[in-house]
């Protein structure tokens, strides 16, 4: 789960929108029901004829997929309405880096001892941002309305509780899990923040706000300098509204544009080799904004073979401005007074 | 109660586009497939595509499929379906009506009073 | 596409008679078979869903069977209210089609 990990995870979204693995019944390692395939689903609402272009990863096979923006991915397993025709499916390898995973709450102590606050707006990245802006490692969602903050001694002592525990839908967000009764969701407070300096020798860096979409008039800055003589990234997901949502990849040393890409102009889909140590990812959104966003994974890379593409000329990186600085959250009846 | 108000009668040339709209109320209209359905004088009902007003996600007949269009205006909690390169043959009444929640989508359980689109030159 | 036929094409009975439709499907298509009623001028209206379950408040005297091409649609004791068109429309698979529809007239 952790932002420092993304080799382990097989998705990038909060939902699993972009899950595209082969577990094919509702609980992980033969466990749950059988998943029924997609192209024998027409009686329901959703089948490989509802996704021509492949756009959702439907098919002729019976894997776990979500197709409609739901929470997490599913499955169908019963071919008529009689009952539960469908199910969750448990996937273990599906969450995002960045997401820790789904704790107990008791309440006394609280798994999350820094300050907290409710909301019947949450999303998980509302809970982000005023975690961040309190200056805490750690933010947890409980209840689909309550948000936690704290910091990794914290979950040294915490008790994992199933995935599926963490239930329930953000009263923000019909697409998004916000923990459950008793039980916190906790994320790393860098998942969607507007800047950041990346050092560790792999990572995933997010669009700012993200899982949310990201906003209107985001200028945004993350510098990467990972141990190695160059480095590799690979866009898990790129979701920009139009090509006035601009994300610029320059030498850090040189200043100069290595590569740019847009809501016109995606990434490749493979991996793409740079041959700098250091570099600046700049992101801006236009006065419209509002898209998905992108994820994508970093490595160092031992050797500097560039991916042969010549750079784009030069320009000067504005500072980032500084994140969460509008964030509200309503205190939490009976909470300690925010730190 | 739940409802579906179409919009009035329309009359269009030939090679002219019709869109033809449905206010839902009294349920979540995000939540409840939409469909659309026409039936020409004297003939049997002929399905033409749906729409899942939460996300957006369409299903067309292929014998429509190069010419409707079908949208929804989620904060208007409306359904719209466009028909475009009229012909006379498009002379129909064409009904909204609500098909099943979420990934169930099993019947036409509410239907609007229908419209009537003529095509005549 | 799923062809759908309805036998007869009209019919005419007595108040109080027993009334059978028949709905043909080109291919097996399960249960998954809904009936409609339509009334002149006005929209259709569902009486029975995936072949035999009545929609709610419909009266009991409308009824369903069959299952994969062959299916009854049957009305124990017509009366002047159910003078319609009735149309039987599969969901097994895209595009959802109808029948022809029987026109039910009484004598």
């Known amino acids: 789960g952790s932002l420092h990990s993304p080799g382990l995870s097989e998705c990038f979204q909060v939902n699993g929108a972009d899950y595209r693995g082969h577990q094919n019944r509702t609980g992980p390692r033969g466990a749950g029901r059988p998943c029924l395939f997609w192209d024998q689903t027409q009686q329901h609402s959703y089948s490989s004829a509802s996704d021509p272009h492949g756009r959702w990863g439907l098919g002729a096979h019976n894997f776990c997929r979500n197709p409609d923006g739901d929470v997490q991915p599913w499955c169908y397993v019963a071919e008529t309405e009689e009952g539960i025709y469908w199910r969750y499916c448990d996937i273990p390898s599906c969450h995002m880096p960045g997401y820790l995973g789904c704790f107990v709450d008791s309440g006394a102590p609280p798994a999350l001892s820094g300050p907290s606050g409710t909301s019947t707006k949450l999303t998980v990245q509302v809970c982000l941002r005023f975690c961040r802006m309190k200056g805490y490692q750690l933010a947890g969602v409980e209840a689909g309305y309550a948000c936690f903050c704290g910091s990794e001694s914290d979950l040294a002592r915490g008790r994992l509780a199933p995935a599926t525990d963490c239930d329930q839908i953000c009263f923000g967000h019909p697409g998004q899990l916000c923990g459950g009764d008793g039980r916190l969701g906790v994320y790393e407070v860098s998942v969607g923040s507007c800047q950041g300096n990346w050092t560790a020798p792999q990572g995933v860096i997010y669009s700012p706000d993200f899982p949310d979409e990201y906003g209107p008039d985001r200028n945004c800055s993350w510098a990467l300098g990972p141990p190695g003589a160059a480095l590799e990234l690979t866009f898990r997901l790129f979701e920009l509204a139009d090509p006035r949502d601009r994300l610029e990849l320059r030498d850090a040393a040189s200043g100069s544009l290595l590569r740019a890409f847009d809501g016109a102009r995606p990434p490749p889909s493979g991996p793409l080799r740079l041959g700098t140590a250091a570099l600046l990812l700049t992101f801006r959104s236009d006065a419209r904004g509002h898209a998905q966003g992108f994820a994508l994974t970093y490595r160092g890379l031992q050797d500097a073979a560039e991916d042969p593409e010549a750079p784009e000329g030069s320009a000067q990186t504005p500072a980032a401005p500084l994140d969460g600085a509008n964030v509200s959250c309503s205190p939490r009846p009976g909470a300690p007074p925010a730190a | 109660q739940v409802q579906l108000v179409q919009s009035g009668a329309e009359v269009k040339k030939p090679g002219a586009s019709v869109k033809v709209s449905c206010k839902a109320s009294g349920y979540t209209f995000t939540s409840y497939w939409m469909h659309w359905v026409r039936q020409a004088p004297g003939q049997r009902l002929e399905w033409m595509g749906n729409i899942y007003p939460g996300s957006g996600i369409t299903h067309y007949n292929e014998k429509f499929k190069s010419r409707v269009t079908i949208t929804r205006d989620t904060s208007a909690s409306t359904a719209y379906m466009e028909l475009s390169s009229l012909r006379s043959e498009d002379t129909a009444v064409y009904y909204c009506t609500r098909g099943g929640y979420g990934k169930g989508d099993w019947y036409f359980d509410v239907w609007g009073q229908g419209t009537t689109v003529t095509v005549s030159s | 596409d799923i062809q759908m036929t309805q036998s007869p094409s009209s019919l005419s009975a007595s108040v109080g008679d027993r009334v059978t439709i028949t709905c043909r499907a080109s291919?097996?298509?399960?249960?998954?078979l809904n009936w409609y009623q339509q009334k002149p001028g006005k929209a259709p209206k569902l009486l029975i869903y995936?072949?035999?379950r009545l929609h709610s408040g419909v009266p009991s005297r409308f009824s369903g069977s069959g299952s994969g091409t062959d299916f009854t649609f049957t009305i124990s004791s017509l009366q002047p209210e159910d003078i319609a068109t009735y149309y039987c429309?599969?969901?097994?698979?895209?595009?959802?089609?109808f029948g022809g529809g029987t026109k039910v007239e009484i004598k």
């Open positions: 291919q097996d298509i399960s249960n998954y």
């Open positions: 995936y072949t035999s």
């Open positions: 429309q599969q969901y097994s698979k895209l595009p959802r089609t």
